[in-house]
């Protein structure tokens, strides 16, 4: 079944209440346009956004009988000439008579006649019609023959994209058979199809077909109204391609359309080959799209690669929601042209600032006002992280302009980063030199505290992403944030009592559900001592509030429960409901407080893992006092599991071996060469995985990667020493909590050649190992103690710079 037949079948179903063989048609109010009813149009009660009235008519091939319901009688079958009268195409019938076509279509043969309706003839240009009537034997006959095919073709035979030779000079008839059931012939719509005749078939069409011998290129070259488009097509090397065979649709902007463009925009695009070609290709479809086939909005891919939405409003065609087609269906031998009075500009031809929509005007206005627009040079590449208009509060807008400029700089990246280029853990650098973190979740992508909304676009010199809030890069660590906010003083003191302060200070990615002092309301000093007294219990409780990974509130899929594994090992349940976070069903008081090593969500109740029993009466009493929302299990004698320190701390053991120094005399000053191992450094970092390992279980973790060697010079007691750090990644057997990353760095005195080889090979994998950055040294006292075999209490910051040209190899490494 063809699309036409399917829609006809639907119309028949809709009309069957009225009797046999009745079809329901929808007529657009205020017009004579009627369509067989598709399912979509029936339920919408509209076509092209205009209300329709339902008409019940006999389905094609049937007729009414007096006194009987519906259309019980079959139409008489006649030759093609007689059938023209049966279907009401009396003008075409008359013209067939006067042009001496009648005897042909009454006689032997098999024909398909695309017969213009009476109204179609009335709508034909009067000069053209007069010309045909004045020369019936040639001009009119040729015109009618151009509506005919030398064989019977029903709608099921009229396949989309077919070109059928007509009976006039074999001139092609473009057939289009659209999914909405519309069938067109050279863009004329079949309004009554498949009227079988003894010697063929008649299809009534809604307009007279004009003879076509020209291509789209020919039309553009001849049409003065398209001279701007013609020149632009020549500039873009596209004009000739519109002369080739094909089934194109061209939305051709008139000169008036080009005049509407701001001159600066046109001058820029026409000076940029890539942009001008994109602009031109955006006006071309590789498919033939007749206006009559558009009965609702549909998206089409252009030759440029992006899509345009073609819709209709009554008799008007709209493109991307704007009514702009002023002349439809200019049929050529390789496609159809619609003249439009606006130039369509694809994103790929726009400057990054031009990509912003109506919802980002506050951002773009500020960028212009504060002089940042001029820094977005056309030959550079940028990414705008544009907050929506309502992200800018009155307070923000009334800020000191210098401060506002700094805020805006956090929303412009130095490079073009498309939506598909973003990944979790990515660091993006702004034009202000700030570093922003990317967090990718199942249904959201966030940068720092702000998550994206739909509408990312890529332009000629950059990309734009739309954000809910103003992006605020974090400045302080979790620990510093807690310390500066008095609401968390009790939690902070417990954290410090549990020796967990370092955890929230050092770099990492954490989500902390931080309980305010309200969570500890009514806790006495004695009870506090009970809690502090059981360090294991305290650590378990605190670490239940901490989850590895940064989870922004807006990053949680709304309305569903998100299960997170805490550092303590138990699960925590988070749900986003109406802009609020529910943590274990408790409402979060505030969320998305960003820090350099994570995010804080504020809770006003202490959280406790429901699956962990308490074995101590006093502790149970205290926890029951503080925690009302769950029933805490009691198992006498049960103790809290010890959480090994490797889970969350960094241990550093440093040994210093006195180097052997060989002095090679040079002409200017001595060159000092180190032999043998200068320093051995074992550096083990651990971060928990989501899985806690049961006692006695062992895990083999293979950490891939080849060794990375780094060399630099340090000054120890005034003597330059060349040091090589070698990072090896190896297979380790770990028992207890699984360590996600294990790095062992050892010293050694590799040669310059080895160093070069490794640096070239592994430059991307090099990371900063030595805390304190360049030239980290121990004070003299510490070194003495080390050399005497003592262990230093702490690492001490550098007070002397790294010397000489060796320093460059340190700086050259990615940090």
């Amino acid at each position: 079944n063809s699309y036409y037949d399917k829609v006809l079948a639907h119309s028949r179903i809709r009309g069957r209440d009225q009797g046999p063989n009745v079809c329901a048609l929808q007529q657009i109010l205020g017009t004579k346009k009627k369509y067989f009813s598709s399912c979509k149009n029936w339920y919408q009660g509209a076509i092209c956004g205009k209300k329709t009235t339902v008409l019940y008519e006999c389905c094609p091939g049937y007729m009414r009988m007096e006194g009987m319901k519906g259309c019980p009688a079959v139409m008489p079958i006649d030759h093609v000439y007689g059938t023209l009268g049966i279907v009401g195409a009396t003008t075409t019938q008359h013209y067939s008579d006067v042009s001496k076509l009648r005897e042909e279509i009454e006689g032997k043969g098999s024909y398909t006649y695309f017969a213009p309706s009476n109204e179609a003839w009335d709508n034909l240009d009067s000069d053209i019609r007069r010309g045909l009537e004045n020369n019936v034997n040639v001009e009119l006959l040729n015109a009618l023959h151009s509506h005919m095919v030398n064989k019977r073709m029903l709608t099921k035979d009229l396949k989309h994209g077919m070109v059928i030779p007509s009976m006039y000079n074999n001139l092609g008839l473009f057939i289009n058979h659209y999914p909405n059931g519309v069938v067109t012939v050279n863009c004329a719509r079949v309004i009554h199809g498949n009227q079988i005749a003894t010697n063929g078939v008649v299809h009534v069409i809604d307009r007279v077909l004009t003879q076509i011998g020209t291509s789209i290129q020919d039309f553009i070259e001849a049409e003065d109204e398209l001279s701007s488009f013609r020149a632009a097509a020549i500039t873009s090397d596209l004009l000739e391609s519109l002369g080739r065979d094909g089934h194109f649709t061209l939305f051709a902007p008139t000169n008036e359309a080009f005049e509407k463009l701001p001159r600066g925009v046109l001058e820029r695009i026409m000076g940029d080959k890539v942009a001008s070609e994109a602009l031109m290709k955006y006006h071309i479809l590789n498919t033939l799209q007749c206006s009559e086939a558009i009965t609702g909005g549909a998206v089409f891919e252009t030759m440029e690669g992006n899509t345009i939405e073609i819709g209709c409003e009554g008799d008007s065609i709209s493109i991307n929601g704007i009514k702009m087609v002023n002349k439809k269906d200019i049929v050529t031998k390789n496609g159809v042209i619609h003249l439009i009075d606006e130039v369509l500009i694809p994103d790929s031809a726009k400057q990054v600032i031009e990509l912003a929509g109506k919802q980002q005007t506050t951002f773009t206005d500020l960028v212009a006002q504060l002089g940042l627009a001029s820094s977005l040079k056309p030959d550079g590449e940028y990414t705008l992280l544009a907050p929506v208009n309502n992200a800018f509060s009155d307070d923000t807008l009334s800020m000191d302009q210098r401060l506002l400029k700094l805020i805006l700089q956090n929303h412009i990246l130095k490079v073009k980063v498309g939506l598909s280029d973003l990944y979790n853990g990515q660091i993006l650098e702004t034009i202000g030199g700030k570093q922003l973190r990317v967090f990718v979740y199942r249904t959201a992508i966030c940068i720092e505290n702000s998550c994206m909304v739909r509408g990312s676009k890529q332009g000629r010199n950059g990309a734009i992403h739309i954000f809910r809030e103003i992006i605020q890069p974090a400045e302080k660590s979790l620990h510093e944030k807690l310390r500066q906010d008095k609401r968390f003083s009790i939690f902070l003191s417990l954290l410090e009592a549990a020796d967990l302060k370092d955890l929230l200070t050092q770099p990492g990615d954490w989500t902390l559900f931080a309980p305010t002092n309200d969570a500890f309301k009514g806790m006495t000093n004695e009870e506090r001592e009970i809690l502090i007294g059981d360090k294991n219990a305290l650590q378990n409780i605190i670490l239940y509030h901490l989850t590895p990974g940064v989870y922004i509130g807006k990053g949680f899929e709304p309305g569903v429960t998100n299960i997170l594994k805490t550092t303590q090992g138990s699960k925590i349940y988070v749900k986003g409901v109406n802009e609020t976070l529910l943590v274990n069903e408790l409402k979060s008081k505030e969320s998305d407080i960003m820090t350099t090593n994570g995010v804080i969500h504020v809770v006003d109740k202490l959280l406790y893992p429901a699956d962990i029993p308490v074995g101590n009466d006093q502790l149970l009493e205290l926890l029951n006092k503080l925690i009302k929302y769950i029933q805490i299990k009691f198992v006498r004698g049960s103790t809290f599991k010890e959480i090994p320190m490797t889970v969350y701390t960094t241990k550093i053991i440093t040994k210093l071996v006195e180097p052997k120094i060989k002095v090679i005399q040079g002409s200017l000053q001595p060159i000092i060469k180190t032999e043998g191992p200068a320093m051995t450094k074992i550096h083990i970092e651990g971060e928990p995985d989501f899985r806690l390992i049961k006692e006695g279980e062992t895990v083999t973790e293979v950490i891939h990667g080849e060794p990375v060697i780094k060399k630099y010079t340090k000054i120890i007691d005034g003597v330059p020493v060349e040091i090589t750090e070698k990072e090896t990644r190896e297979e380790r057997i770990i028992t207890g909590p699984e360590i996600k990353y294990t790095r062992i760095s050892t010293g050694g005195g590799e040669t310059e050649e080895t160093l070069q080889k490794f640096l070239q090979k592994e430059v991307s994998k090099v990371t900063k190992f030595i805390e304190g950055g360049d030239g980290h040294l121990f004070e003299d006292e510490a070194i003495k103690r080390l050399l005497q075999g003592d262990t230093p209490a702490k690492k001490i910051q550098a007070n002397k710079r790294v010397q000489g040209s060796r320093r460059r190899s340190r700086e050259g490494r990615s940090q």
Partner: antibody
């Protein structure tokens, strides 16, 4: 063929106004815009502004904003440029040029010398 | 004072190639296309090159244009005595919202 024919030379006193005409032929007048460019004696070219022959929209050079008015008469395919409050430094040859924007100033008039002198 | 800078003169013998340069800024040539006009002595200017490198019909292919960054150049190969004229570059200036011309280069055929 495309032709732009301008009105004859004018001598004006400072403070007066001048109106130069430019009659187009050989093409559809309303399909193209007209730009006006002037050239002071022995100097370079200076763009004054543009008018759409289709709908009369204009775009003037900032420097002349408020003193210049460009108009068209589609019935006679003629463009006009009026410059008010003339000064001696307005002495120049004034050219009209067909301007379809995509191809700027592809045909020029022969020029009209306007002399501003007291 | 022209916004676009051109060398005041250039010369060559018949058959030689002469290059006329035009320098601007990021708001004119850096952002937009360059067009070139030829003005023969005592006549109106004539469009020679548009959109950096496009020749209108009727302009010999001895004339070619190019643009790079904030500068552009016009090359005249196979120099002829009929090429003796003033050559002006022009571009739209985003900051002034005005079409700006160069100061002009007088090309002399020796």
């Amino acid at each position: 063929q495309v032709q732009l024919v301008q009105s004859g030379a004018e001598v004006k006193k400072p403070g007066a106004s001048v109106k130069v005409s430019c009659k187009a032929s050989g093409y559809t007048f309303t399909s193209y815009g007209i730009s006006w460019v002037r050239q002071a004696p022995g100097q370079g070219l200076e763009w004054m502004g543009w008018i759409s022959a289709y709908n009369g929209n204009t775009n003037y050079a900032q420097k002349l904003q408020g003193r210049v008015t460009m108009t068209t008469d589609t019935s006679t395919s003629t463009a006009y440029m009026e410059l008010r409050s003339l000064r001696s430094d307005d002495t120049a040859v004034y050219y009209c040029a067909r301007d379809m924007l995509v191809v700027p100033f592809d045909y020029w008039g022969q020029g009209t010398l306007v002399t501003v002198s007291s | 004072q022209s916004v676009l800078t051109q060398s005041s003169s250039a010369s060559g013998t018949p058959g030689q190639t002469v290059t006329v340069s035009c320098s601007g800024s990021s708001s004119d040539i850096g952002s937009n296309r360059v067009n070139w006009y030829q003005q023969l002595p005592g006549t109106a200017p004539k469009l020679l090159i548009y959109s950096n490198d496009q020749r209108p019909s009727g302009v010999p292919d001895r004339f070619s244009g190019s643009k790079s960054g904030t500068s552009a150049s016009l090359a005249i190969s196979g120099l002829q005595s009929a090429d003796e004229a003033d050559y002006y570059c022009a571009a739209w200036d985003d900051s002034l919202s005005t079409y700006v011309f160069g100061s002009g280069t007088k090309v002399t055929v020796l």
